[in-house]
């Protein structure tokens, strides 16, 4: 049966918690990604940013999970207007910011 949206969001949050807690060396070798506007369309915007990181097994599950939340196909090099212009941050900071935002969405009952 299909997973309820609240369960899917909680699973994504738990995966991001795992990443932040299990982080020993710099996440994805300190790779930089485009910062995004954490408002509408956050899942696709996050995927558009993280999909440009390759060869980083730590975030592969997150990339797959975000893909399930984003209704359209996302490929590397593709950016929406949700990107914060010319601002790049480390993947570790990106994941932390995304985690805070998604936990707030969960608390507010915004699952889609």
């Amino acid at each position: 049966s299909p997973v309820p949206p609240s369960t899917a969001l909680k699973e994504l949050i738990e995966e991001l918690v795992n990443i932040t807690q299990n982080q020993k060396a710099p996440l994805c070798n300190g790779s930089m990604v485009w910062s995004i506007n954490l408002t509408a369309g956050v899942y696709c915007a996050a995927l558009e940013s993280l999909i440009n990181v390759s060869g980083c097994s730590a975030i592969e599950k997150t990339q797959r999970m975000l893909n399930g939340f984003c209704p359209h196909k996302v490929s590397a090099g593709q950016f929406s207007s949700l990107r914060v212009r010319d601002t790049k941050i480390e993947v570790a900071q990106f994941v932390k910011d995304l985690l805070v935002h998604l936990k707030k969405l969960f608390r507010e009952g915004q699952f889609n």
């Epitope: 609240s6 909680k10 805070v100 707030k104 009952g109």
Partner: antibody, heavy 120, light 112 residues
Amino acid sequence: QVQLVQSGAEVKKPGASVKVSCKASGFNIKDTYIHWVRQAPGQRLEWMGRIDPANDNIKYDPKFQGRVTITRDTSASTAYMELSSLRSEDTAVYYCARSEENWYDFFDYWGQGTLVTVSS
Amino acid sequence: DVVMTQSPLSLPVTPGEPASISCRSSQSIVHSNGNTYLEWYLQKPGQSPQLLIYKVSNRFSGVPDRFSGSGSGTDFTLKISRVEAEDVGVYYCFQSSHVPLTFGQGTKLEIK
């Protein structure tokens, strides 16, 4: 350590406005919510509203809508609550409180309270 | 709005004796994410409120184990197994599942 420090007591005339501040330290204000709760003498605690300092998303109790404005200055790690068109029944202790930083399940830290007296 | 109704409003207790406070909500306070955000706060004379119990039955860190919470749906209870002199104050139940968030009217616990 985590602290919420509020501005001092105020005495206002009916019809005036009051703005109470709540300065956060020991944590990043953007990582949580800041709520405002008041308590009139001998009355129950009353939730007024809350702000998400990360994106300025605000929710109010409709009872106060139009009279209360919650704002924040993230660079100063401070939240504000302004109440306008004051009347005598607004005499109360006003508290700020933060939602705990993990799943935002409860209020784990409170300010010391600010007494606002409305009197002609 | 969800109305929270507490009883009794006044509770005189002999030290060492148990105490129980009831809280009833006017509608279910199960959040759309599946959690029940029902808390109990104690306000000691001249102090800011302090958290005792969250999500119905979880004791906050540092809260003595003589405090316990239970209930579901619309009926909730706070129990103190053996009241101590330091427990005096006003106890509030609080729901944070639905906006506006609402408190019960408070129960004043005093020592006989």
